[in-house]
């Protein structure tokens, strides 16, 4: 027959005033039969907190139903904790008798009524913004006591200075909350950037809590478009390519128009990522010159991340294409980019046929 052990797994429990504290206790055996009692303190002056057998304890409820068969969980929950509840609590097993006889005590759980802040939660803007715009990030942490707390912001490890912080309430309370808003200027290189909110509090013993947010959730990098024509093929087909580069996020739809009529629509998917986190995509269109009498106006229309479409047009000069193999080609690029373009060697192309 195994010897009964009374296990209190937590040496200490820290709880905010006004909240409930759960004090865990399990027994390793149903034998011997007898009730569990909880005491605060030891010795003759110890205070009875809860008795499974008898008494009225309005703030204390057993976590598990004591009437259920095989129950060996004698954990309790104490509601509405106040600073006066601090102390060491002991789970004590009694053997049934007249009176019941104290058999074995758990090691005790120290209840301290001061609370760590919750893990900081960082939230970013509801809608994406483009480079050079300023976006706001909010950091919130709750339930800590005492009120003194330090909050810092970082972007990619560099401390930020443009933020405002409030600790509420201003007066005395059982616990406090902190809210801080930082302003961050986006750059085209921020797809892989991260903002960090760091909270230091006396209860954390020098090991601050951190909340993070990825700027990839807040940034939109619109694409560059470039339409070019390749050499005419032997079968009188002209290969026109639309290079869509340096965009984020990946959500992008490309539509080819021939003389204003939709020729093909494609959705970007599973693109390789550039080192800076942006994407490139190349699509091409084969135009059968011999099928056209007049010049063909080709338009590459790109709708990126739900934004208004960006067009780049290109005219294939049919008159410049004699209907014979190996002739020279002529084309006119009539499109314009809608943003400045800084060239970059790191280009990956994804080809769709």
């Amino acid at each position: 027959e195994e010897e009964l052990q009374v296990i209190q797994p937590e040496k200490s429990v820290s709880v905010a005033a006004g909240e409930s504290a759960t004090l865990n206790c399990t027994a390793t055996s149903l034998i011997p039969v007898g009730p569990i009692q909880w005491f605060r303190g030891v010795g003759p002056g110890r205070e009875l907190i809860y008795s499974q057998k008898e008494g009225h304890f309005p703030r204390v409820t057993p976590v598990s139903d004591p009437t259920k068969r095989n129950n060996m969980d004698f954990s309790i929950r104490i509601s509405n904790i106040t600073p006066a509840d601090a102390g060491t609590y002991y789970c004590v097993k009694f053997r049934k008798g007249s009176p019941d006889v104290e058999l074995k005590s758990g090691a005790g759980t120290e209840l301290s009524v001061r609370a760590k802040p919750s893990a900081p939660v960082v939230s970013g803007p509801a809608v994406r913004a483009t480079a050079e715009h300023t976006v706001s990030f909010t950091c919130e942490s709750h339930g800590f006591s005492p009120r003194d707390i330090t909050l810092k912001w970082f972007k990619n490890g560099n401390e930020l200075s443009d933020f405002q912080t409030n600790v509420d309430p201003a007066g005395k309370s059982v616990s406090y909350s902190i809210r801080s808003t930082a302003r961050v200027v986006l750059t085209r290189r921020d797809v892989h950037s991260q903002v960090i909110c760091e909270v230091a509090h006396v209860t954390l013993q020098g090991d601050p809590l951190r909340g993070t947010a990825n700027l990839s959730e807040a940034i939109r990098v619109p694409p560059f478009l470039e339409v070019t024509q390749q050499s005419m093929r032997a079968d009188n087909q002209v290969n026109v390519t639309c290079q869509v580069t340096k965009f984020y996020p990946q959500r992008l739809q490309l539509t080819w128009l021939e003389n204003g009529n939709v020729s093909r629509t494609e959705m970007a998917s599973a693109l390789p990522e550039n080192k800076d986190g942006t994407y490139n995509w190349t699509s091409w269109l084969l135009v059968n010159v011999s099928a056209h009498r007049d010049d063909v106006k080709l338009t590459c229309q790109v709708e990126h991340d739900g934004q208004p479409a960006v067009n780049k047009s290109f005219s294939v000069k049919v008159s410049a294409h004699p209907k014979e193999q190996g002739s020279n080609t002529a084309a006119e690029n009539t499109g314009t980019n809608e943003r400045d373009y800084k060239d970059d060697d790191d280009k990956h192309h994804h080809h769709h046929h």
Epitope: E1, L30, V33, Q52, K53, G55, P66, T67, R69
Partner: antibody, heavy 119, light 110 residues
Amino acid sequence: QVQLVQSGAEVKKPGASVKVSCKASGYTFTNYWINWVRQAPGQGLEWIAMIDPSDSETHYNQIFKDRATLTTDTSTSTAYMELRSLRSDDTAVYYCAMDYGSLYAMDYWGRGTLVTVSS
Amino acid sequence: DIVLTQSPDSLAVSLGERATINCRASKSVGSSGYNWLFWYQQKPGQPPKLLIYLASNRDSGVPDRFSGSGSGTDFTLTISSLQAEDVAVYYCQHSRELPTFGQGTKLEIK
């Protein structure tokens, strides 16, 4: 000190009903099951049913399921067992017993209530 | 339902001698690491009294001459040295499922 005090003896006619009470003291009534057991004259023990006063969960011996009803009144720490459609072979001492270890056993017993069914 | 059968139905033992009562279950009463078998003593005119719980554990206040043993389907209540006050009817009870009692064994002094 745990005590279970039962109501007094009853004489009933066949077809009638009887309701036996069991008042508990010396412990938290809602924390322990109450069992009901009967013993016919010169016979053995027969388990009738059990009830958890905290939520009125009940388990019945199939033999008594249609005729017995267990209830509790937590305000007075009293358990009740009603037996309907009495027959002469229901003549017995009816015991309430408390399950102190939640083992579906009977640790503390009342002194019993004699129910006599006779025309 | 699990049926408990006690043997013998009655037993006469001399004072100071060992008394042994058996209880056999129609199927195992072992579960969750415990044998859900209990022994009770009932003296004339009194309610039963719990002696042994979970097959082998003496209830508080029960003299150590009483012991329980067994597992699965076969269990034994032993009184190592019979005393005059041990004259009673002894019942086994299981709680592997809903409780049932054995038919009882009457113990007398020879």
